[in-house]
Structure formats: C-alpha cells, structure tokens
Interface confidence: low
C-alpha cells in the first residue's frame, strides 16, 4: 500500500473548486531526498490527468497550467520515473469544476389544509455540479421571519413546518429562496401571498349518498369539508364511462341534490373544495364513492319472434323467442318474463312467468286465432307488453320476398339481399331476417336469431352468432298486417371443401334399378353449405373412368335411385359432397351386383 504523499506534494492554485472555464495551476514537488538515487536531474516527474499523461519535467518540481476542464471531478496524479524502475506515485489532487447557482425560478408555496404546514417549491436551473445549499426564508406581519435550509444536492422543495392561520386572511407573507455554493450565490424573486392564496383545502371526506324512497330521482350526496370551504366541484360518471359530469356549487354545506342519474347504474362520485371564489386553489379530488342507483320499472318493449311447427292434424307447436332489453331499458335486474297466451275468439288465456330463459315453447290447437303478449319484470314493475298475433308466416305467396341471396361479407358476416314481393311492395310493413344453424334433423333446439328491417330496405348484414364453416338456413319474411310471406336460402360466411364424403349405408334393388341410401355428413365436417352430392360407380376391376350422377343438395334427402347399372355386373360405388369451395374426399366404397347378388 502506498503511503500517500510521503514523497512529495501536489498543490492546486487558486483552489480545488473552480469555475467552469477557469485555468488552474498544478505544482508537483518532491520532498528532500525523495528523488531518484545519485542524480536528481534524472528525476522525471510525470503529471497524469486520470490515466493519461499530460506533462513531465526533469527535476525536483513540475508546474503545469491546465485549462478546459469539464464540469465535474477531474483527478490529477503526479508520478516519479527513475531509470530502470517502475513509476512511483508521489501525490494527487481532485479538482472540482462547477458553476455558480442560477437564480431559482417559479417559487410557489402551498399549505395543504387549514391545519397543514407551508411548503414551497422552485426550479433550480442548471446543475452546478457542486454542493449547493438552498435557504428558504419566509417573512410575515409583525417582523416575523422563518428560515429553513436544504442539504440535498437536488433541493427544490422545503417544508417550513409552520401553519398559517385564518385570523388575518388578508395578511401578506413573502417567501424567497437563496442558492449558495463555493462559486457564488443567487436569490429568487420574492413571492408574496396571503392565507387565502396558498391554503389548498384538504379533499372532502366521508362521502355518502342517499336515495329518498329508493328513487333515483330523489338523490342527495353528502360529504364533510374543512370549516372555511366556500365552493365545491362535484364530478360523477357511470363506472364504465370515461366522461365526467361536472357541477359547481357554492355554500353547499356538505350536501347537494343530483337530478339526472340513470337508474340501476353504478356511478363514481368525487368532490373537490375551495376557500374563495377567485383566490387560492382547488383541493385534490376526494377518494371516489362508488354507488349503484336504485331500479326503476323497465322502459321499452321486448323484441319478440316466433316459430310454428306442425305436429299433427289437430296440434301445432309454438316456440316464442325474445331478446333481452338493453341495460338502459331494463333499468334493473330482470327477475322474470311474463308470457300470456290467448285465444282471441273464445277468450281463453294462460299466463306463465319464465325465469332464466328468453324462449318458451307450448303446444296449441291448430284451430282458433291465437295471440301472445310478453313483458319483462324487475323489482319495480313490468315493461309494456309486446303483443303478437300468431299467424302462418309463409302463407301469403304473393308477399314472399324475391331473389333472396346470401353472400359472405368478411369475417363471420353474411350479407342477405332480396327484392320486394310481387304484391304491392308498399303493403310491406317490415321485413324480418331469421337465421339458424342448419341441422339435417330440423332440430328445434337450435338457437334462433333474427333482426328486423324497415320496409324500404332490401338487404341486411347478419353477424350475430355467425361462425365460420357453418351453414345457416336464412329466411326473409315480409309482414303486412296479419299476413306474411317468406323465402329461404342457405348461406355461410366462410367455406371449404367438406372434410369427408357421405357414408353409404344401404343399396337395395327395386325393379331393375338400385336405391342408394346414405348418412348425412356430420355438421362439423360439412365446412359450409353443401351444394351437391355426387354418386360415382364403375365396374369392379375396371380401369375405366367412373360414371357419376350429381344430385342437388336438399336438407332432408338421404337416398337416390340409379337405373343405369347392367345386370350381373359387380360395381363399386362411392359418394362425395360439394360446397362452393370444392369436392370432399370419397366416402366409403360399396360393391353391388344387380339380381340379388349384392355384397
């Protein structure tokens, strides 16, 4: 370990701390008998700035004038080099380069709350790179002065720890901050203020809300404030909204009535306070109060649709469907739906409450005129009922919309277009577009979707509950009074070739021809709407091209005759299915020979 500066000294003039741009003289001198042995003129003193040589001199001392030192700390080390030996460290010095403090700017003071303490902030200006002390001085009436010092190099905030009181709210106080370092000092412009200027009230607390008679129209917000508060700002918004409603109130004394709240909505409320109309500053916003407004009876009416299904000569099945009310219409939690079914001529009626579902199915006679009414109920009451006369929606052929088409429109959308019916188009009161997944069995449990369209529209974009690679049965109804006409089409939003072909399950012989029966392709393998089936056949062990028969796809069809087979010839048969995107792979192969020789 080097015994530092035992062999010599490094002195710095004028000082170890210098102003940026100043010149400094560095002297390195050897103590007596500390040079190289024998010949002092062989002493070679070398001055390093950090680890870079900047000067050298033969003799007992070295003088170096250094300029252009950067802001911050620079280390100088003096070393002695003798012949045939390593350099020996003599001594060193750090030089600190900085600037005098700039004038502190934008001095401002605040007292948080009537019981708080005065604290001030300012902008320091550029970094001095030296230790700089800040002194904050506050002078008030009756020659009172307070002083506080800051020992943090980045000091731009000080709390006096004193409390200004409202006894003389108009009394003037003056604050000033002074920055001092070894290169100079600078003071801010004085900041003069009164109690009312700098006291920022504490945010209101203990916020509560009261709904008189559980009604949203009689709502009062309560809170507590510091004693001198004159003004309040209230802001409130539904919890799912980003926009605030703002209200300014004077002399509220901790309460305010709110008149425009929506029912059954969670709101967030905040309040801020101020001591004077035009002096001082607003408090921070209070902590949020979250509260749900009471329910009100539902508004609006349910959108109801229905489906009829023939059961036998005397009975029919009616399935009713309805859509949930929007949140703003429901105005509360819907507890149940009330469905009333009425026979209009005989006056028979039945009412049922439905919970947890938005559909209802019943069986009624095929005779009589039937109507239904559906309403939604919450804890405060019921919506107006939606009334529908049950009719045969497709009975009026002249009301059937024409040229219905369904085309894919981007991801999971289908554009349905049609032409008005031949019968006077002005008779149409509305169109209803209905769609449901196509299931070969005609399954009534498949969810039904619908939308209503104005009578002047001839297209509708359907996107709700539309999945890729699924075929939908789409119906367009034209409704006019108690009559309706309909047209249907199959459509998909996206399609591919089917993943498999139909499975032939039986081949039977009938009067010289054969009847082929097959199982439908599973829905998840159809990959869209099927357009055709193809039946292929060729003689067993033959290399000839197969013959084929193409059958347009119909939902219920699963058999087809072929009468072009030769007797006593063994044939191989198979089937494929086609969508607009292409043909499936082969289904299973079956061999068959006419005249009872089937395998």
């Amino acid at each position: 370990k080097i015994d530092a500066c035992k062999r010599g000294d490094v002195t710095v003039k004028p000082s170890h701390v210098i102003l940026l741009g100043s010149t400094v003289n560095i002297t390195c001198s050897l103590k007596p008998r500390q040079g190289c042995f024998h010949y002092s003129r062989r002493n070679k003193l070398i001055l390093y700035k950090f680890d870079r040589r900047i000067n050298f001199h033969h003799g007992h001392s070295l003088n170096s004038q250094v300029t252009g030192l950067p802001l911050g700390t620079t280390l100088f080390v003096c070393k002695l080099a003798c012949i045939n030996s390593d350099e020996i460290q003599i001594c060193g010095a750090e030089i600190f380069v900085g600037v005098a403090p700039e004038q502190p700017q934008n001095l401002s003071c605040i007292q948080k709350g009537e019981q708080g303490t005065v604290a001030c902030t300012w902008e320091r200006g550029r970094d001095t790179h030296l230790y700089t002390e800040y002194t904050l001085q506050l002078s008030g009436p009756k020659n009172l002065t307070w002083q506080k010092q800051c020992k943090d190099i980045y000091c731009d905030y000080l709390d006096f720890g004193i409390n200004l009181t409202p006894e003389s709210p108009e009394s003037n106080f003056t604050a000033k901050v002074t920055a001092v370092n070894s290169l100079g000092s600078s003071s801010s412009l004085p900041s003069t203020f009164t109690f009312l200027d700098i006291v920022r009230p504490l945010p209101p607390w203990d916020i509560r809300i009261k709904f008189q008679k559980a009604s949203v129209s009689r709502c009062t917000l309560y809170w507590r404030d510091e004693g001198l508060v004159l003004l309040n700002r209230l802001r409130y918004r539904p919890s799912n909204s980003r926009l605030w409603n703002m209200v300014n109130v004077t002399k509220a004394k901790g309460r305010h009535d709110l008149l425009d709240l929506k029912p059954f909505t969670e709101y967030e409320f905040q309040i801020s306070s101020k001591l004077h109309l035009y002096k001082g500053s607003w408090s921070d916003w209070s902590e949020s109060l979250r509260a749900q407004t009471p329910e009100e009876e539902p508004t609006g009416m349910l959108d109801v649709w229905y489906m009829k299904r023939h059961i036998d000569y005397s009975r029919q099945q009616i399935s009713l469907f309805w859509k949930n009310l929007s949140v703003s219409e429901a105005r509360g939690k819907i507890l149940h739906y009330q469905v009333t079914l009425q026979e209009l001529t005989g006056g028979k009626a039945m009412t049922q409450n439905i919970t947890g579902h938005t559909s209802w199915t019943t069986v009624i006679p095929r005779t009589g005129n039937w109507a239904v009414a559906v309403s939604a109920a919450n804890s405060k009451g019921s919506s107006l009922p939606t009334r529908i006369n049950i009719m045969n929606l497709c009975e009026a052929g002249l009301l059937a919309p024409r040229q219905v088409s369904a085309n894919s429109e981007g991801m999971d959308n289908i554009l349905v277009t049609w032409q008005p019916p031949r019968k006077d188009p002005s008779a149409v009161q509305e169109y209803v577009v209905e769609w449901r997944e196509l299931h070969p069995g005609g399954d009534t449990q498949v969810p039904l979707n619908w939308l209503r369209s104005r009578p002047y529209n001839v297209s509708a974009l359907i996107s709700e509950n539309i999945k890729s690679y699924i075929c939908y049965e789409i119906r367009v109804y034209a409704l006019s009074g108690d009559q309706g006409g309909c047209s249907s089409i199959l459509g998909n939003s996206k399609h591919k070739a089917p993943l498999s072909g139909p499975h032939i399950n039986a081949i039977t012989e009938e009067k010289g021809s054969i009847l082929i029966s097959w199982n439908s392709i599973p829905v998840q393998e159809q990959m869209g709407c099927l357009l055709h089936y193809r039946i292929y056949w060729k003689e067993r062990d033959s290399n000839s091209q197969p013959q084929l028969c193409e059958i347009p796809y119909r939902v219920s069809q699963n058999s087809h005759p072929i009468n072009s087979l030769q007797p006593r010839v063994t044939y191989v048969l198979w089937m494929t299915a086609l969508t607009a995107a292409g043909e499936s792979s082969h289904g299973n192969e079956r061999e068959f020979c006419l005249q009872g020789k089937a395998n």
Partner: nanobody
Framework: QVQLQESGGGSVQPGWSLRLTCAAS????????MHWFRQAPGKGLEWVSS????????YYTDSVKGRITISRDNAKNTLYLQLNDLKSEDTAVYYC????????RGQGTQVTVSS
C-alpha cells in the same frame, strides 16, 4: 438506498486529536472513492480530503495537509478521518460523502475546538 453515518466528533482543546468514523451501506463501498467535507458555522461546505476506492491514493485540501489522515477499511465498509493537532479553525460539522460534490452525504458529526 445509500446510507452514511458519521460519528466520533466532540469538543476538544487546541492541539488534541480526534478520529472520525463513517459507516457506509446501500452501495458497493469497495468500488467507490470517498470524501470528507466540513461546514464551519456560517460558512459554505468545504472539501477536506478524498481517498480512492482501493485506498492507495489520498488527497487533502492545503489547509489540513500534514495534520489530517484519511483511510478506509473495505472489509468493514468504513471510512476514517484522523484529525491531529486540532486548531480552532477546524471547528465545523464534518460529513462523509460518496461523491465529490458532497451531495450524497450523512447527517454529520460536530467537532468543536476551543480553549
């Protein structure tokens, strides 16, 4: 965070000695150059002495050379300042610092020299 705690100050007569200690934590002491500053009553902060991280290089302000010795024990994370032949003008609060501007420093220890 960086913590520096000075101790060892006191009231002494001129010519006496004191050894000041600075206990450091919250940073890698063994790789940091360390510094002593002092502030006399009514004066600004004055740099006194510095020592390199390994302890091999030491520096002193001209007014204290020969009377003051800076040293360190990296194993104990401790910095020392030996004050000999104390004079009345050495009366001040002494601070140890991690940086040469004196920004990161402790609370200080009071040294009072009077007869």
């Amino acid at each position: 965070q960086v913590q520096l705690q000075e101790s060892g100050g006191g009231s002494v007569q001129p010519g006496w000695s004191l050894r000041l200690t600075c206990a450091a934590s919250g940073f890698t002491f063994s790789t940091s150059g360390m510094h002593w500053f002092r502030q006399a009553p009514g004066k600004g902060l004055e740099w006194v002495s510095s020592i390199s991280s390994g302890g091999g290089d030491t520096y002193y302000t001209d007014s204290v050379k020969g009377r003051i010795t800076i040293s360190r024990d990296n194993a104990k994370n401790t910095l020392y300042l030996q004050l000999n032949d104390l004079k009345s003008e050495d009366t001040a609060v002494y601070y140890c610092s991690k940086d040469p501007s004196g920004a990161t420093r402790g609370q200080g220890t009071q040294v009072t020299v009077s007869s």
